[in-house]
């Protein structure tokens, strides 16, 4: 089931997935002057079975100026540049496809791409968030925000996040300890059903990553 | 509550143009692919284009060389220009949302519709 929204936005932060669940799409999008191409893709799709996981479809990008061809337009040096700097800011692949059944990691850049991601996640997705540069992280509870199935409608739950203006970069998932706070988990879910997968995991998970998981550009 | 709302339907003449816009309300977009179908009486809803956030899109071959789709987000408005009309394209034509392009081609799936705005074409 796709969520209906995007993850929460919280002031001065971002969100990244470590790894997406099967069902997700990321929409094959080309940065200006270049489209898709006639039979390419509209989306890529998380898809396997039990012990693997990977990206169906393949986004390509192709000159405005060269409708209707199929040909992969080689970026100018400056395109080139400005492509790496991207990759530089995201270093890691997020996670090891092998440590988190029915996932896929992070796609690799493609050529031309454009510099906005937009991810169609689905139930059971987590999202992290980090301060942005500059701002730095006051915790009452956890980072994160899980999308959830209640009463047959979807919902992200509320991060716990609050990004203070100070000089000071945070690192992830933060600096501050967590206060125990009745506010942590602010929703009260015992009334019906939830559906919730891979939380666990997903959170054990995130305790042993790297803390450079975040680009401006793929919020 | 989600609305769409489509306008500019009409009556042309063959050869003639004509612009459909599709305002939609309720909720944000951002992660909606939106686009256009026409259904003729007794035929099943035929897909036409779909276009996401970011502009990428999609367009049945049959109409890919005259009619274009485009967003406007800051209206979350979506438009379908229609070029070089032809009797068979009188059809109602609905505007969709849909919260992913995997499933748009398949009227079905898609989330939500709009009323539908009447397009006909005759001499």
């Known amino acids: 089931e796709l969520c209906d929204d995007d993850p929460p936005e919280i002031p001065h932060a971002t969100f990244k997935a470590m790894a997406y669940k099967e069902g997700t799409m990321l929409n094959c999008e080309c940065k200006r002057g270049f489209r898709r191409i006639k039979s390419g893709s509209l989306y890529m799709l998380c898809t396997g079975n039990s012990s693997h996981s990977s990206w169906d479809n393949q986004c390509q990008c192709t000159s405005s100026a060269t409708r209707n061809t199929t040909k992969q337009v080689t970026p100018q040096p400056e395109e080139q540049k400005e492509r790496k700097t991207t990759e530089m800011q995201s270093p890691m692949q997020p996670v090891d496809q092998a440590s988190l059944p029915g996932h896929c990691r992070e796609p690799p850049p493609w050529e031309n791409e454009a510099t906005e991601r937009i991810y169609h996640f689905v139930v059971g997705q987590m999202v992290y968030y980090q301060c942005v540069q500059g701002y730095r992280a006051l915790h009452r509870g956890p980072a994160e925000s899980v999308c959830k199935m209640t009463h047959g409608k979807t919902r992200w739950t509320q991060p716990q996040l609050i990004c203070t203006g100070e000089m000071e970069t945070s690192q992830f998932p933060g600096e501050e300890k967590p206060q125990a706070s009745p506010e942590g988990r602010p929703e009260s879910e015992t009334s019906c059903l939830v559906t919730t997968t891979d939380f666990q995991i997903q959170t054990e998970m995130a305790a042993t990553m790297e803390t450079s998981i975040f680009t401006t550009e793929y919020q | 509550q989600v609305q769409l709302v489509e306008s500019g339907g009409g009556w042309v003449q063959p050869g003639d143009s004509l612009r459909l816009s599709c305002a939609a309300s309720?909720?944000?977009?951002?992660?909606?692919?939106m686009g256009w179908f026409r259904q003729v009486p007794g035929k099943e809803r035929e897909f036409l284009s779909v276009?996401?956030?970011?502009?990428?899109?999609l367009d049945a071959d049959s109409v890919a060389d005259r009619f274009t789709i485009s967003r406007d987000n800051s209206k979350n408005t979506v438009y379908l220009q229609m070029d070089s009309l032809k009797p068979e394209d009188t059809a109602v034509y609905y505007c969709?949302?849909?919260?992913?392009?995997?499933?748009?081609?398949?009227?079905?799936?898609?989330?939500?519709w709009g009323q539908g705005t009447q397009v006909t074409v005759s001499s």
């Open positions: 969709a949302a849909d919260r992913g392009p995997a499933r748009y081609i398949s009227a079905s799936d898609v989330d939500y």
């Open positions: 309720g909720r944000s977009f951002r992660n909606y692919v």
């Open positions: 276009i996401t956030w970011l502009g990428g899109t």
